[in-house]
């Protein structure tokens, strides 16, 4: 008699997760009588997948009717494939006995499962960073197979290059995860900017998955401060304004100090947004010149988004304003926008508040 052959024609089969996998197996002879069993893996630790003779295998069905006369087709279909089903499957012929005796195994069919990556999740820094600093964004996607995957980062459509990407595990696995970190330099114009993590995989048919993060959640744009004095009014009052411009987020507190003493504190709220996503705010202070003998040092102190206060000071020189005159004062207006105080020398007299 010709020796029995157990034929598994496919060396490998690739199936999308959720689909059914057909594993083919035929025997070359009806002899000897005995069952076929399917196993995943070889050796003592192999896992029984299907036994024609006995057992309950709800996800496995015989492709050919096992009661068909002279049946030599022992192919099986496994439904609802998951990445955990990946492995090498062996069709094994047994000789009928008590118990049945293993006779011959097929060469094995490797089942690989194509599993889609999960939607990429992009997370930014835990705390805001100031413009002109670099921050890190991470992107994670899980559960894909095979291991080959492409991940790209974009900022406003431009690909980022300062990127570090890892796929885990390094060895063979039923499914894989990817984690990537991109370092992004924030600019003052980035309030409306977006970073995109784009994942391409064989299971996605050329339609990559994207995860996004808005830089508005990561960025802080500090304000510019400018303190100016308007023309002297007929009633000897000078209007001093503090212009706070181009800041983000809106969380801002402004305090006027007169000769170092707190005069008024205001909180920004419901401000209109600039085109670039930043905000502007102006606060006015009316100073009654005739009520002052000495020069008055006015300070506009701005605390933005919990950061250390930024001050701009302005000195009003009372001597430059005769009390009976209502003429304009030539103001010396110098200084910088910085933390701490800068003196802006100008002339004015005693002050009076007015607040918008």
């Amino acid at each position: 008699e010709e020796e029995l052959q157990v034929i598994q024609p496919e060396k490998s089969v690739s199936v999308a997760a959720g689909d059914s996998a057909t594993l083919n197996c035929t025997v070359s002879s009806l002899i000897p009588v005995g069952p076929i069993q399917w196993f995943r893996g070889a050796g003592p630790g192999r896992e029984l997948i299907y036994n024609l003779k006995e057992g309950h295998f709800p996800r496995v069905t015989a492709v050919s009717d096992p009661t068909k006369r002279n049946n030599m087709d022992f192919s099986i279909r496994i439904s609802n494939i998951t990445p955990a089903d990946a492995g090498t499957y062996y069709c094994v012929k047994f000789r009928k006995g008590s118990p049945d005796v293993e006779l011959k195994s097929g060469a094995g069919t490797e089942l690989s499962v194509r599993a889609k990556p999960s939607a990429p999740v992009v997370s930014g820094p835990a705390v805001r960073a100031t413009a002109e600093h670099t921050v890190s964004f991470t992107c994670e996607s899980h559960g894909f197979s095979p291991r080959d995957i492409t991940l790209k980062w974009f900022k406003n459509g431009n690909e980022l290059s300062d990127v570090q990407t890892n796929v885990d595990p390094a060895g063979k696995s039923v499914s894989y995860s990817i984690r990537s970190t991109a370092r992004v330099l924030l600019t003052r114009r980035d309030v409306h900017s977006q970073v995109i993590c784009e994942v391409a995989h064989v299971t996605l048919q050329g339609d990559p998955l994207r995860g996004t993060a808005n830089l508005s959640e990561a960025i802080r744009v500090p304000p510019f401060l400018e303190v100016t004095q308007q023309s002297m009014r007929a009633d000897n009052q000078v209007n001093v304004t503090c212009q706070v411009t181009k800041f983000y987020p809106q969380r801002l507190q402004l305090t006027w100090l007169e000769n170092g003493n707190v005069s008024r504190t205001e909180m920004a709220s419901a401000l209109p947004e600039n085109k670039d996503g930043t905000y502007n705010w102006t606060s006015w202070l009316l100073v009654n010149v005739s009520a002052h003998r000495d020069d008055v040092k006015l300070t506009c102190q701005v605390e933005h988004d919990g950061q250390p206060a930024v001050n701009k000071s302005f000195s009003v020189k009372v001597s430059a304003h005769p009390k009976e005159q209502g003429s304009n004062t030539a103001a010396e207006n110098t200084g910088t926008n910085e933390r701490g105080s800068s003196d802006y020398k100008d002339d004015d007299d005693k002050h009076h508040h007015h607040h918008h």
């Epitope: 008699e1 009806l30 002899i31 009588v33 005995g34 069952p35 036994n51 024609l52 003779k53 006995e54 057992g55 015989a62 009717d65 096992p66 009661t67 068909k68 006369r69 002279n70 049946n71 009928k96």
Partner: antibody
Framework: QVQLVQSGAEVKKPGASVKVSCKAS????????INWVRQAPGQGLEWIAM????????HYNQIFKDRATLTTDTSTSTAYMELRSLRSDDTAVYYC????????????WGRGTLVTVSS | DIVLTQSPDSLAVSLGERATINCRAS??????????IFWYQQKPGQPPKLLIY???NLDSGVPDRFSGSGSGTDFTLTISSLQAEDVAVYYC????????FGQGTKLEIK
Amino acid sequence: QVQLVQSGAEVKKPGASVKVSCKASGYTFTNYWINWVRQAPGQGLEWIAMIDPSDSETHYNQIFKDRATLTTDTSTSTAYMELRSLRSDDTAVYYCAMDYGSLYAMDYWGRGTLVTVSS
Amino acid sequence: DIVLTQSPDSLAVSLGERATINCRASKSVSSSGYNYIFWYQQKPGQPPKLLIYLASNLDSGVPDRFSGSGSGTDFTLTISSLQAEDVAVYYCQHSRDLPTFGQGTKLEIK
């Protein structure tokens, strides 16, 4: 271990019917044919019919086609053979047997059920 | 229907001697390279037991003193050295189409 356990002996009057059961264990009932064979006292083996429990497909010996009916209950892995219009020459041991190789052979047998038809 | 005829109807053989039983089919029982003949042994008070399938293949647990041969229409069951426990009735069965049995051969010790 494949086992086929048959129901107990029956005594029937001519013209009556008998239903013999065969409870299978130790294998997947729906994957193998069940045959029914009888043996009159001192006589040879006579094939009656066979049934595929997965879909109840049956094949009958022409001699028994009009009088025998095979059924199965897959929930209890039990096969049944009913023989109607009994005559005295139906007195025999009735065997169920499982076809393990799908070759229309009889690999495993029950111990038999004696049916006696007598007035 | 295919009719199977066994010969002889009964046979007496000495212990240790060869016993040969023949089975002739009314037409060929061969198909696709296989001979659809099966041999059974039945001892008193017991159900039959499969000995040989597809003419020449020993079923599991059957002693190798039993063998089967033949093709087409003529088949033989041979016991090379008769043992006391081999006393039984032997039946051939075909499954070229729906099964039928031969009439049986009674084997006794001489």
